[in-house]
């Protein structure tokens, strides 16, 4: 369950995250599995551990192997495994399959290609992008933050796209490249004013004081890949991050699901250890895209706890 493949090229930076993630305050110890040797945390080492991250600055072919991360969480030390493979640089332009990240597809209206794993690195814009080893030039290509946008996508735009960026660690720079395939979908998608499937407008959700509660905000935005679509929660009209209540968090990562061909997004609001004051708040599920914004409001009501022990 908690094992992950990671790969990189020799003489480039590679940063691997422990597949067994914990809370930021948890200590994480790293070991090279074959020898059970501890990975040092001192940054002067070429390979060193930094909390949940294992850094190869730069990577060498001999670094390949399985690395164990142990998350020192309460009650149990939880173990994860990172299977790292470092490859020699290819002399020709071909990028072998084993160096490819997941394929992404786009259409005329939506053609975003994200640079894989870039969020693990300390990089600064702009990214360099290449298609089949040729640097991308022309007004149709726009490097925006961590992704590439292609205007007026055509079937000829399909191919292998490589992003290249510089990772900075304590003043030293290391190159990183990552490649993924891009395919072009023929089907014509469309975009609609957001439709919120859950929660119902003015829904009353029963919760138990002292227990955890989850609220799911689910909305659909049209058919096919959407260029701009988001769902989020607000508390009393304030963003969750700005509200400042650590017990109430949005679940990271909005998974785009295609049910009946529709493009839908979910966002789960997790309330830990529900308190009386939570019942007084207004919970707004917001869905927005280029057409506009739709809001459904939820309120919490107390559910009498069941005595599980009687």
């Amino acid at each position: 369950k908690f094992s992950k493949q990671s790969w990189g090229l020799e003489n480039e930076a590679l940063i691997v995250r422990c597949p067994r993630q914990g809370k930021p305050s948890y200590t994480v110890d790293w070991y090279y599995s074959q020898t059970n040797k501890s990975i040092p945390t001192q940054e002067r080492n070429r390979v060193f551990a930094s909390g949940q991250l294992l850094k190869f600055l730069p990577a060498a072919v001999a670094d390949s192997g399985i690395y164990t991360c142990i998350v020192r969480s309460p009650t149990f030390n939880r173990t994860g495994y990172a299977n790292v493979t470092i490859y020699k640089k290819q002399s020709d332009c071909n990028v072998p399959d084993y160096l490819m990240y997941s394929t992404v597809s786009g259409s005329e209206k939506n053609s975003k290609i994200y640079c894989p794993t870039i969020d693990l690195y300390n990089w600064t814009a702009p990214l360099e992008w290449f298609k089949n080893c040729q640097a991308l030039q022309g007004s149709r290509y726009r490097a925006h933050k961590s992704f590439l946008v292609i205007d007026n996508v055509m079937t000829e735009d399909a191919g292998d796209y490589t992003c290249k960026f510089i990772h900075n660690e304590n003043g030293a720079n290391y190159s990183v490249t990552a490649t993924r395939s891009f395919t072009v979908k023929d089907e014509q998608g469309f975009s609609l004013f957001p439709v919120i499937g859950a929660p119902a407008q003015n829904e009353i959700k029963e919760v138990e004081i002292g227990k955890n509660a989850n609220l799911t905000c689910s909305a659909c935005f049209g058919k096919g890949t959407q260029f701009l679509a988001a769902v989020l929660w607000q508390l009393n009209g304030t963003k969750i991050t700005d509200f400042g209540e650590p017990r109430i968090q949005q679940e990271e990562g909005q998974n785009q699901s295609f049910s009946n061909g529709l493009a839908c997004l979910d966002m789960v609001l997790r309330i830990a250890d529900v308190k009386e004051e939570d019942l007084l708040l207004q919970y707004d599920c917001l869905a927005l895209n280029l057409h506009g914004l739709r809001r459904h409001t939820v309120r919490l009501s107390r559910k009498n706890p069941i005595d599980h022990h009687s």
Partner: antibody
Framework: EVQLVESGGGLVQPGGSLRLSCAAS????????MHWVRQTTGKGLEWVSA???????YYPGSVKGRFTISREDAKNSLYLQMNSLRAGDTAVYYC????????????????WGQGTTVTVSS | DIVMTQSPLSLPVTPGEPASISCRSS???????????LDWYLQKPGQSPQLLIY???NRASGVPDRFSGSGSGTDFTLNISRVEAEDVGVYYC????????FGGGTKVEIK
């Protein structure tokens, strides 16, 4: 209603085997750490084993190598396979819910079963 | 292994009077996340244990507010502000910092 129901206890001879089961309902079983805790007659509580959401298992020295904990998330079920049983293993065995291993949220061992009795005797 | 030591072994109480139980661990129960992984449980006669207090001082759902937990590091206390007849049973402290270890228990009975 959040509930744990144990079964499988009984009388077994020393050196014998027994498999305990625990059926969970009323919560998302797959995200929780689960424990077996036992209590010998008139004595205190002793932790016997645990399994986290990844299926990683944990045991105290007293049962390591003899007991095996497992889970079947699709069936909301927890198991304890007990081999090479000794008279000292005679106890009431409780199935208990631990923390949320997905979010690392801990609210105590907040749900306990009614217990199932294991007697090891010749 | 972390060893948990409870005192007293037995505690005769008078309804309406306060009572307290002490629990000591062989090492600090403070985790790097800032919480003390110490719980209190009550096992009433003929019943399964039930959670009273978790993480040192948090009352579990449905637990009367006459129960409170305090302490830090290695020394913890369970307080009952006014004992009621239904509070009789065996009280256990338990550490959850490194697997689980229970204290020996304190038997609370009406005088």
């Amino acid at each position: 209603e959040v509930q744990l129901v144990e079964s499988g206890g009984g009388l077994v001879q020393p050196g014998g085997s027994l498999r305990l089961s625990c059926a969970a309902s009323g919560f998302t079983f797959s995200t929780y750490d689960m424990h077996w805790v036992r209590q010998t007659t008139g004595k205190g509580l002793e932790w016997v084993s645990a399994i986290d959401l990844a299926g990683d298992t944990y045991y105290p020295g007293s049962v390591k190598g003899r007991f095996t904990i497992s889970r079947e998330d699709a069936k909301n079920s927890l198991y304890l396979q007990m081999n090479s049983l000794r008279a000292g293993d005679t106890a009431v065995y409780y199935c208990a819910r631990g923390g949320d291993g997905y979010n690392y949220d801990y609210y105590g061992i907040d749900v306990w079963g009614q217990g199932t009795t294991v007697t090891v005797s010749s | 292994d972390i060893v948990m030591t409870q005192s007293p072994l037995s505690l005769p109480v008078t309804p309406g009077e306060p009572a307290s139980i002490s629990c000591r661990s062989s090492q600090s129960l403070l985790h790097s996340d800032g919480y003390h992984y110490l719980d209190w449980y009550l096992q009433k006669p003929g019943q399964s244990p039930q959670l009273l207090i978790y993480l040192g001082s948090n009352r579990a759902s449905g637990v009367p507010d006459r129960f409170s937990g305090s302490g830090s590091g290695t020394d913890f206390t369970l307080n009952i502000s006014r004992v009621e007849a239904e509070d009789v049973g065996v009280y256990y402290c338990m550490q959850a910092l490194q697997t689980l270890t229970f204290g020996g228990g304190t038997k609370v009975e009406i005088k």
